[in-house]
Amino acid sequence: MAVTACQGLGFVVSLIGIAGIIAATCMDQWSTQDLYNNPVTAVFNYQGLWRSCVRESSGFTECRGYFTLLGLPAMLQAVRALMIVGIVLGAIGLLVSIFALKCIRIGSMEDSAKANMTLTSGIMFIVSGLCAIAGVSVFANMLVTNFWMSTANMYTGMGGMVQTVQTRYTFGAALFVGWVAGGLTLIGGVMMCIACRGLAPEETNYKAVSYHASGHSVAYKPGGFKASTGFGSNTKNKKIYDGGARTEDEVQSYPSKHDYV
């Protein structure tokens, strides 16, 4: 029961996290114009990984894509790569984890195979989350560096009364979405890895219990589970005794539909 709950919760948390990573990657507000200590402008600038936007006070917003690859800063390219790797790994992890869920029956898939898949998806979620956190952190670091550089020469105009105020950028909403989403994916991955330990067959030494039936004796031995150090092919998990109670394995649940807009 606890294993199924941990696995299910890990899946849901990872699903939310990956949806968040996708959202953050697509968002335009990775960096936003710093309004603190700046003259109030009738124009608001913000930038994403794929395009930069300008919102005028008049309500008109104009966005321009970065139609160059070679002209973009290496750091931005690195952030894009990290986020995409995170999304791809997360998506594969989700696919794998769907088949690994205890509540979903696929043919005669053994628990050891499900344990393997759970661990694989967990590791994928952990790496996905780390990629997202790393990507967002690299971008944040880039912003901080640029912020202090532009603060150092805030007013670039020389001579006379003419001044050019440099636009400074600060953390946008996408960074916080990315950090939270990366963290959730990471937590989900850890939960999947924990669930994997419970799914893995263990070698436990139970004493055989004798049940005396009328006329002849039948000995029922509880099936052993191999320890989670490895998933050998020598473990055949046959149901040896079923007391008639409906186990968690048999409870059917339907995966909920998560629409990402």
Epitope: A42, V43, S57, S58, G59, V162, T167
Partner: antibody, heavy 118, light 113 residues
Framework: QVQLKQSGAELVKPGASLKLSCKAS????????INWVRQRPEQGLEWIGW????????MYNEKFKGTATLTADKSSSTAYMQLSGLTSEDSAVYFC???????????WGQGTLVTVSA | DIVMTQSPSSLTVTAGEKVTMSCKSS????????????LTWYQQKPGQPPKLLIY???TRESGVPDRFTGSGSGTDFTLTISSVQAEDLAVYYC?????????FGAGTKLEIK
């Protein structure tokens, strides 16, 4: 076509209050901001502030913050400017104008002449 | 507040002549985000409200004759009328559309001989 129709001329006493109206037609009223501009006799233009009828967001010129209050009524597609504590310095033509690309003012009302005199 | 300085304050020309008027702002009106200058030009004829001529320093509003051209960047801007017509008799205002409060120049009065 887009039209901004302003209320008629007003003659008020110093210290009095006044509410000017600007009725919009020919476009979606809630989508575009309405600006108010003052022009004193033989002088230039002064921006008072703007209101976005959609969410009633306002922005004022600090100079007019105590004097002008901008409101809008979506049901009648009308923007209003309440002027309080009027002095002879406030005698001017007041225009309303629709916000446009580049924060420019594209369509203007015909103007309301306000005379503050004892 | 941003100070908009227009020059000359008035000029008298004959029909068909080319006219240029200047507008200087106390701070740059260039937005780095889209590389656009937030400067607007208006024409106000006697007894009428102002009329939008040019926004983003050089974009002509639809319906405005192509004899009107806006140019310049940063702090220095120019409005050029390639061949003045009698109906161009008006006061021309430039406006800072970048910083709050939005401010206007004192205007350039164009008179026809």
């Amino acid at each position: 076509q887009v039209q901004l129709k302003q209320s008629g001329a007003e003659l008020v006493k110093p210290g009095a209050s006044l509410k000017l109206s600007c009725k919009a037609s020919g476009y979606t009223f809630t989508t575009y901001g309405i600006n108010w501009v003052r022009q004193r006799p033989e002088q230039g233009l002064e921006w008072i502030g703007w209101i976005f009828p959609g969410d009633a967001t306002t922005m004022y010129n600090e100079k007019f913050k105590g004097t002008a209050t901008l409101t809008a009524d979506k049901s009648s597609s009308t923007a209003y400017m309440q002027l309080s504590g009027l002095t002879s310095e406030d005698s001017a033509v007041y225009f309303c104008a629709r916000f446009y690309y580049g924060n420019s003012f594209v369509d203007w009302g015909q103007g309301t002449l306000v005379t503050v005199s004892a | 507040d941003i100070v908009m300085t227009q020059s000359p304050s008035s000029l008298t020309v004959t029909a068909g002549e080319k006219v240029t008027m200047s507008c200087k702002s106390s701070q740059s009106l260039l937005n780095s985000g889209n590389q656009k200058n937030y400067l607007t030009w208006y024409q106000q004829k006697p007894g009428q409200p102002p009329k939008l001529l040019i926004y983003w320093a050089s974009t002509r509003e639809s319906g405005v004759p192509d004899r009107f051209t806006g140019s310049g960047s940063g702090t220095d801007f120019t409005l050029t009328i390639s061949s003045v017509q009698a109906e161009d008799l008006a006061v021309y205002y430039c406006q800072n559309a970048y910083y709050y409060p939005l401010t206007f120049g004192a205007g350039t009065k164009l008179e026809i001989k």
